[in-house]
Interface confidence: low
């Protein structure tokens, strides 16, 4: 998870039991009961935007204290503000909770820029617009932080949904989702639909608008179109996957596929951008520049530092190429591709000086820690984190921003040989996810 370029989720609805289930479609493979169908009480339970994260409403303690919590598939700690901070409207007050238990242990989490530190404990946690259950979960009470909370983001904590291997201070601290599955009958799966607005949202618009859905324990058919295609989770730490090919407007980048996954490729709702390893980023930008050469953009734009604006309603989407990532499929020698549009990788931003214009940042950036499929990818798709079957599913999101001519796509199968060789084997050192 890369803070600052990472996302939030928020919900503001009322909790109901795991609810209605539609009968399984006849052409689907058999699954555990209750995994698919309608999860009305969880649909639209997220708020936020890609630049500041998507957040869900949670309650902690007894009596319940309501907080907005960033949904982050790139980390594994449940951590909440627990002391006054200029950017927090509210925070977790442990002394007011009769069910709080102190673990008498500290936790320190540094990032490349910024950090947070706090005190570990456990308390009762529930998700009002999630399953109708309460669990005792580990909570890091953040007492000090630097460049972690975002002014105006409206979230007060972070829900790390990845695996225990990357939890801080170590993998013995059980992540929230593990606790949820252990203590309840909620199936070991969740799915995310992050809905990019396609245009800048001010503070009140974010609060009033739906940012998407986090379906806990299942898959909701209303949130996607077409079929779900699954890629294996390579290793249970981050949600690590293997990319086997990259195309820009159908043109293969023609790189050794190991480069695409150097040193890993992860799906991370807490990162704004599509982040690519240096060599891949350079090749991709060169190809995108060539495809969009009818207009010339400053170098600062391609570095994500400079806005490019067009007169309202005149953004030339058609000059920008689509980007396809081919992912290893579940079946041997089979891959599938996910395709995003410029509507995903050009991130709308409000430029005060030119508020009559539509302004964008290039939301593909360089990484030294592998490929990160952040919000710009996830906003195109409904993404199923099927932990029970160690796989991640992608389908075209019912809420993705597109135009009359092109749409995001998930297509397959494609015959692909020796895909395992595309994975990079990280030398065994104590690498931290949080140092990206």
């Amino acid at each position: 998870t890369q803070h600052g370029i990472r996302l939030p989720l928020r919900s503001g609805l009322g909790g109901a039991p795991l609810g209605l289930r539609l009968p399984r479609e006849t052409d689907e493979e058999p699954e555990e009961p209750g995994r698919r169908g309608s999860f009305v009480e969880m649909v639209d339970n997220l708020r936020g935007k890609s630049g500041q994260g998507y957040y869900v409403e949670m309650t902690v303690g007894s009596p319940p204290q309501t907080l907005n919590i960033l949904v982050d598939t790139g980390s594994s700690n449940f951590a909440v503000g627990a002391a006054p901070h200029p950017f927090l409207h509210r925070y977790y007050q442990r002394q007011l909770s009769s069910t709080y238990r102190d673990l008498r242990k500290g936790v320190y989490v540094p990032y490349t820029q910024g950090k947070w530190e706090g005190e570990l404990g456990t308390d009762l946690v529930s998700i009002p617009h999630g399953p109708n259950v309460t669990v005792r979960a580990n909570i890091a009470a953040i007492t000090e932080s630097d460049k972690f909370f975002i002014n105006g983001s409206n979230w007060e904590g972070i829900l790390g949904l990845a695996y225990a291997e990357i939890a801080r201070p170590d993998d013995s601290l059980e992540p929230f989702f593990d606790s949820l599955v252990k203590q309840t009958h909620v199936p070991n799966l969740f799915s995310l639909q992050l809905c990019g607005a396609g245009f800048p949202l001010n503070q009140s618009e974010v609060l009033a608008s739906v940012g998407g859905s986090m379906i806990i324990g299942g898959i909701d058919h209303s949130l996607y179109t077409g079929s779900l295609w699954y890629t294996p989770i390579r290793r249970e730490w981050y949600y690590e996957v293997i990319i086997v090919r990259v195309e820009i407007n159908g043109q293969d980048l023609k790189m050794d596929c190991k480069e695409y996954n150097y040193d890993k490729s992860i799906v991370d709702s807490g990162t704004t951008n599509l982040r690519l390893p240096k060599k891949v980023f350079e090749a991709a930008v060169k190809s995108i520049k060539a495809a969009s050469s009818t207009e010339k953009f400053p170098d600062g734009f391609w570095l994500g530092e400079q806005l490019v604006c067009w007169q309202a309603g005149t953004t030339p989407w058609n000059i920008f190429p689509v980007i396809s990532l081919y992912l290893m499929g579940e079946v041997t020698n089979q891959s599938f591709r996910i395709t995003i549009l410029p509507q995903q990788y050009l991130r709308p931003v409000e430029d005060v000086a030119t508020s009559q214009d539509d302004c964008y940042k290039f939301a593909i950036s360089q990484s030294s820690t592998g490929t990160v499929m952040g919000a710009v990818i996830m906003e195109g798709f409904y993404v199923v984190f099927d932990r029970a079957r160690k796989r991640i599913g992608f389908a075209v999101s019912a809420c993705h921003v597109h135009d009359e001519f092109r749409t995001a796509a998930v297509e397959g199968p494609f015959v692909t040989l020796d895909m395992e060789d595309c994975g990079y084997n990280i030398p065994q050192t104590d690498e931290s996810t949080l140092m990206t």
Epitope: G198, A312, G313, Q343, D358, H402
Partner: nanobody, 127 residues
Amino acid sequence: DVQLQESGGGSVQPGGSLRLSCAASGYFYSRWYMGWFRQAPGKEREGVAAINSGGSITSYADSVKGRFTISQDNAKNTVYLQMNSLKPEDTAIYYCAAALSRVPGFFPLFPSQYNYWGQGTQVTVSS
């Protein structure tokens, strides 16, 4: 809030013409889309035509291209749908809709993209 009022519906013989109007009142955004949709008995509501606030972008369903024209009069906050060469299959209730948003990649013929709807006006094409 925004109110939409359609008018101009009626009965006409095949090959005939009608002009529908949609008057918008209330608070209005500077960037918006107006669309015409229709719903025949037993069928889903479908997009017919749409226009952006500047009038620079128009979209039509394949079934009406070349026969229907959408236009607007910004001064009157009114959008028109000129329907020529009408066919029996054009029979439906016609709705005017407004999308008060700034989505650059807006999909104008999808009903789900629209925030505000009129009450509808009946168009019947029959000999």
